[in-house]
Amino acid sequence: MGRARDAILDALENLTAEELKKFKLKLLSVPLREGYGRIPRGALLSMDALDLTDKLVSFYLETYGAELTANVLRDMGLQEMAGQLQAATHQGSGAAPAGIQAPPQSAAKPGLHFIDQHRAALIARVTNVEWLLDALYGKVLTDEQYQAVRAEPTNPSKMRKLFSFTPAWNWTCKDLLLQALRESQSYLVEDLERS
């Protein structure tokens, strides 16, 4: 093992001082799996990235520690880092657009991604395409792709163009799109999740 620990440390060392502070505060309130305790606040707040990694691994073991770290990073809006942390711990495969490492393709993620399940509905019902493009720009979409989607005349044709790039995306890339949809049209996502 050891890979998960290294990946946690790498993620934490790639947080700025402000982000590390925010990470610790979120760790104090993040929901935990049954049977796991919380790292004491006093000890937690004074730790550097290395100490915190050791503490996370000793409290939660490597696998759950990595998962918990990824959850907190995601909660901080750092989807890309969370995805890369999971990539490093699971060693997945598949194409990785515009600077995102490939996460596990199927581990604990059976079936189609939400984005693929609801492709037709999203093409028909997404209205705030510009928001999605800005959220994905430089992370999942290259400059060329971004411009190609923007050039389309209507929202459905923009979405259709956006979906033309998704076959090359991995799970993390699709998560970024889903996250952007939650931020821009949460009611639509909720509606589709219920359907």
């Epitope: 890979r3 290294d6 990946a7 790498d10 993620a11 790639n14 700025t16 001082a17 402000e18 890309e80 880092m81 890369q84 990539a87 490093a88 060693q91 997945g92 495969s93 598949g94 194409a95 990785a96 657009p97 515009a98 600077g99 490492q101 490939a102 720009y137 430089g138 290259t142 400059d143």
Partner: antibody
Framework: EVQLQQSGAELVRPGSSVKMSCETS????????LTWVKQRPGQGLEWIGY????????EYNEKFKDKATLTSDTSSSIVYMQLSSLTSEDSAIYFC???????????WGQGTTLTVSS | AIQMTQTTSSLSASLGDRVTISCRAS??????LHWYQQKPDGTVKLLIF???GLRSGVPSRFSGSGSGTDYSLTISNLEQEDIATYFC?????????FGGGTKLEIK
């Protein structure tokens, strides 16, 4: 300790190709991207492209799309860059660097000097 | 492509000085800005990542700040070993681009 060791200097003829290497150690090779950067004498840095060695995915700077080809050998933890149809404009120092989680280049090789001359 | 501009190509300062090197992007780069040091022997090293994150092992006299399009690297107490060329780089959008560099010399 993370280390990136690049191959030695090359002197080649115009029109030919060259393949330089970047040998990595001290980390899990397949969980990171490796990127390449060009520096002409006395000039700035230009990003060429990157490869994710875990799956072979590549992205190139449009400017280098027909010039550079990035490949990797996971069994030996080495990344290669092949440059084709060489001209004097390709004479430069080429650096490999590991791609960090913020898309920064967190460890750098020492550079490979390429001289294209007849 | 996003243009990165370091308006000062060379800078002279005295040991112990506080030195600030600036970098401007042609559009908002949302803090995806990193600083590198290239020593006279050619070796390159990451100093600051994501605007303000100090790379482990880099002396605390180095700091980074900025937002939007304007960013800066500050060396609070210049030492002889800081003589080098400093480059900024954006990674918000492909192709990733560097500033032209600022060469720091001792007065």
């Amino acid at each position: 300790e993370v280390q990136l060791q690049q191959s030695g200097a090359e002197l080649v003829r115009p029109g030919s190709s060259v393949k330089m290497s970047c040998e990595t150690s001290g980390y899990t090779f397949t969980t990171y991207g490796l990127t390449w950067v060009k520096q002409r004498p006395g000039q700035g840095l230009e990003w060429i492209g990157y490869i994710y060695v875990g799956n072979g995915y590549t992205e190139y700077n449009e400017k280098f799309k027909d010039k550079a080809t990035l490949t990797s050998d996971t069994s030996s933890s080495i990344v290669y860059m092949q440059l084709s149809s060489l001209t004097s404009e390709d004479s430069a120092i080429y650096f490999c660097a590991r791609l960090g989680l913020r898309r920064h280049f967190d460890y750098w090789g020492q550079g490979t000097t390429l001289t294209v001359s007849s | 492509a996003i243009q990165m501009t370091q308006t000062t190509s060379s800078l002279s300062a005295s040991l112990g000085d506080r030195v600030t090197i600036s970098c401007r992007a042609s559009q908002d780069i949302s803090n995806y800005l990193h600083w590198y040091q290239q020593k006279p022997d050619g070796t390159v090293k990451l100093l600051i990542f994501f605007t303000s994150g100090l790379r482990s092992g880099v002396p605390s006299r180095f700091s980074g700040s900025g937002s939007g399009t304007d960013y800066s690297l500050t060396i609070s107490n210049l030492e002889q070993e800081d003589i080098a060329t400093y480059f900024c780089q954006q990674s918000i959008l492909l192709p990733w681009t560097f500033g032209g560099g600022t060469k720091l010399e001792i007065k």
